[in-house]
Interface confidence: low
């Protein structure tokens, strides 16, 4: 699972699978966003 | 104007204790997720502990070279950043960077200080 | 750990020419990558997230892309500020890991 502070944002957004917040090996999210340090 | 300003490095034996402050001004501090980020001198970026912001309950996570001697905290009322050493050793020898991040959705922000060199010899 | 490897460790080139850099995930990363550029002396600076944003205020020349365990980081007409060095980052997974570097040097 995908718990890092781009990924709660993303989780947050609804844009992370919602079976347990997992991301599929398929699953590329949309660019907005993601973390930086 | 953002600033970043790290403070408390130095020179202490292996085994001794520093404590590292970051003193945040010109943004929401207490929204933003901060990480400590180190450099060995000549060498590459190393991630080194992460606390989260106030409405994620400010919660941590660390690298495992760290884990067990380092805690990081915050104090949103102060605007302040802290890294609590202990155990330090040879290796842990670098300039500790702060690094400030926060979504906003639609784009990111990203700030880091200038750094504070800790030294761990003998 | 998600382990980055960066390619190539130095480049030598020459300002005007593009600059192509790689980086490569031990394990699949989707598109949570960014690029730094340091200069000797200063801290790191960031000009690319989520594997293809540019960030604020960083000149368009600088392109990223990829996604998966593949990444690249372009600079399309390299300026004399540009030589440094550019390391690449995940934030995929705890720790955070970042590449090795790789040196940009003028030729």
């Known amino acids: 699972a995908c718990d890092t502070a781009t990924c709660v944002t993303h989780r947050l957004a609804g844009l992370l699978s919602r079976s347990g917040g997992v991301v599929k090996n398929n699953f590329v999210p949309t660019n907005v966003g993601s973390k930086a340090f | 104007e953002v600033q970043l300003v790290e403070s408390g490095g130095g020179l202490v034996q292996p085994g001794g204790s520093l404590r590292l402050s970051c003193a945040a001004s010109g943004f929401t501090f207490s929204n933003y997720w901060i990480s400590w980020v180190r450099q060995a001198p000549g060498k590459g970026l190393e991630w080194v502990a992460e606390?989260?912001?106030?409405?994620?309950?400010?919660?941590?996570h660390y690298a495992e070279a760290v884990k067990g001697r380092f805690t990081i905290s915050r104090d949103n009322a102060k605007n302040s950043l802290y890294l609590q050493m202990n155990s330090l050793r040879a290796e842990d020898t670098a300039v500790y960077y702060c690094?400030?991040?926060?979504?906003?959705?639609?784009?990111?922000?990203?700030?880091w200080g200038q750094g504070t060199l800790v030294t761990v010899s003998s | 750990e998600i382990v980055l490897t960066q390619s190539p460790a130095t480049l030598s080139l020459s300002p005007g020419e593009r600059a192509t850099l790689s980086c490569k995930a031990s394990?699949?990363?989707?598109?949570?990558v960014s690029w730094y550029q340091q200069k000797p002396g200063q801290a790191p600076r960031l000009l690319i997230y989520?594997?293809?944003n540019r960030y604020l205020g960083i000149p368009a020349r600088f392109s990223g892309s990829g996604s998966g365990t593949d990444f690249t980081l372009t600079i399309s007409s390299l300026e004399p500020e540009d030589f440094a060095v550019y390391y690449c980052?995940?934030?995929?997974?705890?720790?955070?890991?970042f590449g090795q570097g790789t040196k940009l040097e003028i030729k």
């Open positions: 394990k699949w990363v989707t598109t949570y």
């Open positions: 980052s995940q934030s995929y997974n705890y720790p955070y890991t």
């Open positions: 690094t400030a991040y926060f979504d906003y959705g639609l784009a990111i922000q990203n700030y």
């Open positions: 989520g594997a293809s």
């Open positions: 606390i989260r912001s106030e409405s994620d309950a400010s919660a941590t």
